[in-house]
């Protein structure tokens, strides 16, 4: 955690770092470690990648324990093989308007991600890509035989875009806030970020919050009922304390997590809220971090690693964040 103790390095020599990740001396000058990357958690011992102009942003002077790797002010962004200047806006595709800010890209949808529930007029709603149209549109498959109305199919469930409009006009400032990014980890503690100018000076700034989609140790597939393919929001039996680099949350939380599917779908946060969580460290220091809390999850086929560089990320975003 800190550098007060003697140097203790893992027995094996230098670790093997993934491609593009620097091998650096830890912050104590003791051991060689793989540098933390943009948006990852960092500590004095776990430094950020200096070759990418990253530094460990502890958020406030009071908290010197755990930070987030952040690009220095004005750092450019590399997105889809193109370099964008900090402050530059661009359309990643016809579907998304993006902004680069100090090495982080925040994007907002240009297409509606509305849902449609079945009705007599549209018993089998589907979203489809129509020729010559950028955004998918709803089509209503009529039943083959109009006299036989079978059970309505489940509505096409994308994550929703409800809650306050992210674009507001306020005193000569067009307030824009991107959606929270997907959690950087599919299990365990990760980071979620967004870009906003919703502040007194109307300046773009990055915000980050801790997030946990599900605990890594939970074997959720065991809980899927016979005949079912998914467990969307598994019941958490007991309140838990969150752990963050050796520090433990002061309070216990009956948090909701997202489940899993056995049919290739992935379950991701659907509606979330952001709340402050206090962590107490072994040396007695207390620090406050914003954290994502899940209200509902959705299971869908738009899983990480799908074709579109941004779309697979976008569909895993947390919408409708409720304060």
């Amino acid at each position: 955690q800190n550098c007060s103790g003697p140097c203790r390095c893992p027995a094996e020599q230098a670790p093997r770092c993934p491609a593009g990740v620097s091998l650096v001396l830890d912050g104590c000058g003791c051991c060689r470690v793989c540098a933390k990357q943009l948006g990852e958690l960092c500590t004095e011992r776990d430094p950020c990648d200096p070759h990418k102009g990253l530094f460990c942003d502890f958020g406030s002077p009071a908290n010197r324990k755990i930070g987030v790797c952040t690009a220095k002010d004005g750092a450019p962004c590399i997105f889809g093989g193109t370099v964008y200047r900090s402050g530059e806006s661009f359309q990643s595709s016809c579907k998304y308007q993006c902004t680069c800010l100090d090495g982080a890209v925040g994007c907002m949808p240009l297409c509606s991600m509305d849902v449609r529930l079945p009705s007599p007029d549209c018993p089998f709603p589907r979203r489809v890509k129509l020729p010559g149209k950028c955004c998918e549109e709803w089509v209503c498959d009529e039943p083959k035989d109009q006299t036989v109305v079978g059970p309505a199919l489940a509505a096409y469930r994308l994550e929703d875009t409800f809650g306050p409009d992210p674009t507001m006009i306020r005193a000569n400032c067009l307030v824009q806030t991107t959606e929270w990014s997907a959690c950087s980890k599919t299990c365990g503690m990760g980071i979620s970020t967004r870009v906003t100018n919703d502040n007194a000076s109307c300046r773009l700034e990055k915000q980050s919050r801790l997030c946990m989609v599900r605990p890594c140790e939970a074997d959720l597939e065991e809980n899927i009922k016979k005949g079912k393919k998914c467990i969307r929001t598994p019941k958490i039996s007991k309140p838990i304390k969150f752990e963050l680099s050796g520090c433990t949350s002061v309070k216990t939380y009956r948090a909701k997590f997202c489940g899993v599917c056995t049919d290739g779908r992935c379950c991701t946060p659907h509606r979330t809220t952001t709340l402050p969580v206090e962590f107490k460290c072994p040396d007695g220091e207390v620090m406050k971090k914003n954290m994502m809390f899940i209200k509902t999850c959705a299971c869908h086929y738009n899983c990480p690693g799908d074709n579109d560089i941004f779309e697979s990320l976008y569909y895993r975003k947390m919408y409708g964040d409720m304060a």
């Epitope: 509305d114 007029d121 549209c122 018993p123 709603p125």
Partner: antibody, heavy 114, light 110 residues
Framework: EVQLQESGPGLVKPSQTLSLTCTVS????????VHWIRQHPGKGLEWLGV???????DYNAAFMSRLTISKDTSKNQVSFKLSSVTAADTAVYYC????????WGQGTTVTVSS | ETVVTQEPSLTVSPGGTVTLTCRSS?????????ANWVQQKPGQAFRGLIG???NRAPWTPARFSGSLLGGKAALTLSGVQPEDEAEYYC?????????FGGGTKLTVLG
């Protein structure tokens, strides 16, 4: 963001025609139908009629003779006309989107009185 | 005239389970009635919770589930929260028109 907004006169004289407009944003009325529902003070909901995405209409049989629902797709607006109104038509009138009645307007209060 | 009947009021304790039902006067409710459930909280606008018998709207928590139960449409709330206190209306489709039920006032104790 999906929104529906009802507008029209708050006061209508008996025997006249009540005209309301539902202005829609965040979705297209050529993709979703729009329903009209009313609620008498302290009472439940009463379904009045619907204009479907393709322009067809269905009405509550009790209002068939005096209700007309139409739409202007270019303006994304649905209009509601109820003729020969009486005091019994005093209510809060709502428009709601088809598909689970998922989105509703805030409602507009209509009083029928001379 | 078709009548759709709901329990006028129900009371439940936080964390409990409650089932609201929607009965049709002309026979069993089926999937072709496209049962819808609409919620109104005090001082708030109406919003749809369930459409097409069992499909949840995106904002509808997983503790709400729609089904057909003994020839009636049913809305089951498991693990009831204080914020679930509201008026709930069902609406059934009859080939050419919808009919709303009289509504159920759900009270959450505590």
């Amino acid at each position: 963001e999906v929104q529906l907004q009802e507008s029209g006169p708050g006061l209508v004289k008996p025997s006249q025609t009540l005209s309301l407009t539902c202005t829609v944003s965040g979705f297209s009325i050529s993709t979703f139908g729009v329903h009209w529902i009313r609620q008498h003070p302290g009472k439940g909901l009463e379904w009045l009629g619907v204009i479907w995405r393709r322009g067809g209409t269905d009405y509550n049989a009790a209002f068939m003779s005096r209700l007309t629902i139409s739409k202007d797709t270019s303006k994304n607006q649905v209009s509601f006309k109820l003729s020969s109104v009486t005091a019994a038509d005093t209510a809060v009138y709502y428009c709601a989107r088809d598909g689970g009645f998922d989105y509703w307007g805030q409602g507009t209060t209509v009083t029928v009185s001379s | 005239e078709t009548v759709v009947t709901q329990e006028p009021s129900l009371t439940v304790s936080p964390g409990g389970t409650v089932t609201l039902t929607c009965r049709s006067s002309i026979g069993a409710v089926t999937t072709s009635n496209y049962a819808n459930w609409v919620q109104q909280k005090p001082g708030q606008a109406f919003r749809g919770l369930i459409g097409g018998t069992s499909n949840r709207a995106p904002w509808t928590p997983a503790r709400f589930s729609g089904s057909l139960l003994g020839g009636k449409a049913a809305l089951t709330l498991s693990g009831v929260q204080p914020e679930d206190e509201a008026e709930y209306y069902c609406a059934l489709w009859y080939s050419t028109h919808y009919v709303f039920g009289g509504g159920t006032k759900l009270t959450v104790l505590g």
